[in-house]
Interface confidence: low
């Protein structure tokens, strides 16, 4: 037989396939000229001995073959004996090792077999219905297709799909989509409406990430409030790395995550802006306020499920750095200013009470008092914190109110509202022999002394009756008790206690008399 | 709280061979997938085997398909990475990691990961 025709005789191999799972296999064969013919396989497994032999079966039942040595592309023409016009069986034998393989049979008229490619260039993703739909450019004089796609993911193995017949400019594929794992696909296609045509090769991959972004594992941690009252935010941990299907390992365009930072300032809500996106990368500055700090993972698909942290307030205190005067027109604060053109957010809530019930004040932008202060007032009407209880408050400055991450905090502490030297008065004062000449004078503790740095000290006033001579006692704002010694028998005393505070004086409780008995010996 | 604490790390000759060992605890072991995954140097992190809870469904990264064998031993709560045939590209700081779930292919993610062993390949 001529190498240029397919020779009617047997095969120069014995006729039994070996059933292994190596082998030929994905014959095509087209008409690739007017008069010329293609066929090409793949073959799995060791290449080293292996000659292959392309089969032809006519309609008619005879068979023959082309000798193709170890290629594994063999081109003919309409000469070399094969029924061109007419539907013909192909498959490839291998003979190797001793044994025969066989590649699965393709049955088709080879004149109208066109040689298809498979999508090429971009191929657009999206998401449809829950579903993926791939879109792309009809290869040139190609309209007229059958599309199929293959998927897999890291963990399983290559699953076919049908896109369907295709009839125009643009081919498009629904295909499923994963919510959590990443997807590789290939499409191939074939001409529509001829019978045994051969399919194209496979497209590049097509990298898709699930429809949920995967969440990072990361944990936040904020070192301690500066001196400019600002603290860093710092991440504990990377993001964690999505696992890729083998084909979309190293660069897989279109499996990106895009990882944000949203901070949502929970502090001093009269402020303009609450929240503000950042790149993950970039750890902001935060005031020493309460946040929630969310990370934001999208992808091509939009953004995936919220993680989010709470990053409590500082709460640390200062208890000097607020001076309060209260006047008969209102209360004014006054503290040390940050610098020029300053806004300040002025936060105050009753203590123990849920964060939610905070109210805030917002200043306009003020320039340092010539003593360098900044001050904050309010009257009496207004009703800020003008109840006889203890608040917290917190004062935070910024040059630029509307950007989040350049609010810091100026100062933390305790005010006593309303009436504070009156109600501070301490109650319940009594009086008890001591010995003598000593009494131990009692009371219950101020309301002051509820809230932390507020209550300097108590005063303790004992007045003789008779000389009309007063002595005042100090006492720390953590007792309660003072022993009043060197007291005469048998004179009338008083005695009473006021709590006072940094910057005002308490008022005094209700005199207590008291006497001395005089002993009386037997 | 997770804690796993990877150990066998160390300097080795192209062509030899190490045995990394991790000791999981903080959670029910026997109940988790369990991953290897490295870091070379200057690189992201790379997925390199998987064993899912029971032990007969196990995956590798093409790079150590042949050469790596990976194991548990769910008694005593410890995963194993025999490394064999060595190579200089093998050399990256090795994680054990926890999956989200009991199959080795029921998350693509690692929830928790230890602190990692050297492992240095080079003549």
């Known amino acids: 037989c001529r190498t240029s025709e397919c020779c009617f005789q047997d095969p120069p191999y014995p006729d039994a396939d070996s059933g292994s799972a190596s082998g030929p296999r994905d014959l095509r064969c087209y008409r690739i000229s007017s008069d010329r013919y293609e066929c090409s396989w793949q073959y799995e497994g060791p290449t080293a001995g292996v000659s292959h032999f392309l089969r032809c079966c006519l309609s008619s039942g005879r068979c023959c073959y082309f000798a193709a040595g170890s290629a594994t592309r063999l081109q003919f023409s309409d000469q070399a004996g094969v029924s061109v016009l007419y539907t013909v069986t192909l498959w490839v034998e291998s003979w190797a090792r001793n044994q025969t393989e066989k590649s699965p049979e393709v049955t088709l008229q080879l004149y109208n077999s066109v040689k298809y490619e498979p999508p090429l260039g971009d191929i657009k993703v999206s998401k449809l219905a829950g579903q993926l739909r791939m879109e792309w450019e009809t290869p040139d004089n190609q309209v007229g297709a059958e599309v199929q796609f293959r998927h897999r993911t890291p963990s399983s193995p290559w699953k076919l799909g049908d896109c369907g017949p295709q009839d125009d400019d643009t081919e498009s594929c629904l295909c499923p989509l994963e919510m959590n794992v990443a997807q590789e696909f290939q499409l191939r296609r074939r001409q529509l409406g001829s019978q045994g045509s051969s399919w194209s090769k496979w497209s590049s991959p097509v990298c898709v990430p699930p429809e949920n972004p995967p969440q990072p594992q990361v944990r936040f941690s904020v070192e301690q409030l500066g001196q400019d009252g600002r603290r860093r935010l710092t991440l504990k941990e990377q993001p964690t790395q999505l696992e890729l299907p083998e084909g979309c390992q190293g660069l897989a365009p279109g499996t990106e995550v895009t990882y944000r930072l949203q901070l949502h300032m929970l502090s001093c809500p009269c402020k303009a802006k609450a929240t503000r996106t950042l790149h993950l990368g970039k750890m902001p500055y935060l005031s020493g306020a309460a946040y929630n700090v969310a990370v934001i993972s999208s992808n091509q698909f939009g953004p995936g499920l919220n993680q989010t942290w709470h990053i409590p307030a500082d709460t640390h205190t200062e208890p000097v750095a607020l001076n309060i005067s209260v006047g008969t027109n209102g209360t004014t604060m006054y503290w040390p200013a940050r610098a020029q053109s300053m806004t300040y957010c002025i936060e105050w809530q009753p203590v123990g009470q849920d964060g939610g019930l905070a109210t805030c004040s917002l200043t306009a932008p003020q320039d340092p008092d010539p003593a360098g202060m900044a001050t904050y007032s309010w009257s009496r009407e207004s009703g800020a914190m003008g109840q006889e209880k203890c608040y917290y408050i917190t004062i935070f400055a910024s040059a630029h109110p509307e950007k989040l991450t350049l609010w810091s905090t100026v100062l933390s502490t305790y005010h006593f509202g309303g009436n504070a030297s009156a109600a501070g008065t301490p109650h319940h004062v009594s009086v008890k022999n001591h010995s003598l000449d000593s009494v131990s004078v009692d009371w219950a503790p101020s309301l002051l002394s509820t809230c932390p740095g507020v209550l300097k000290e108590y005063v303790v006033r004992c007045r003789d009756e008779d000389s009309k001579q007063v002595s005042e006692h100090p006492v720390q704002p953590t007792e309660t008790q003072v022993t009043l010694s060197g007291l005469r028998a048998g004179v009338a005393y008083t005695v009473q206690v006021r709590a006072d505070t940094a910057w005002l004086r308490g008022v005094w409780s209700q005199p207590q008399r008291f006497s001395i008995e005089v002993q009386v010996s037997d | 709280q997770v804690q796993l604490v990877e150990s066998g790390g160390g300097l080795v000759q192209p062509g030899g061979s190490l045995r990394l060992s991790c000791i999981a605890s903080?959670?029910?072991?026997?109940?988790?997938?369990m991953k290897w995954v490295r870091r070379p140097p200057g690189k992201g992190l790379e997925w390199v085997s998987v064993?899912?809870?029971?032990?007969?469904?196990?995956k590798y990264s093409d790079a150590v398909r042949g050469r790596f064998t990976i194991s548990r031993d769910n008694a005593k709560n410890t995963l194993y990475l025999q490394m064999n045939s060595l190579k200089p590209e093998d050399t990256a700081v090795y994680y054990c990691?926890?999956?989200?779930?009991?199959?080795?292919?029921?998350?693509?993610?690692?929830?928790?990961r230890g602190q990692g062993t050297q492992v240095t390949v080079s003549s």
């Open positions: 903080g959670f029910t072991f026997s109940d988790y997938a």
């Open positions: 064993i899912d809870s029971e032990g007969p469904t196990i």
């Open positions: 990691a926890k999956s989200n779930g009991g199959s080795a292919f029921s998350s693509v993610l690692y929830t928790d």
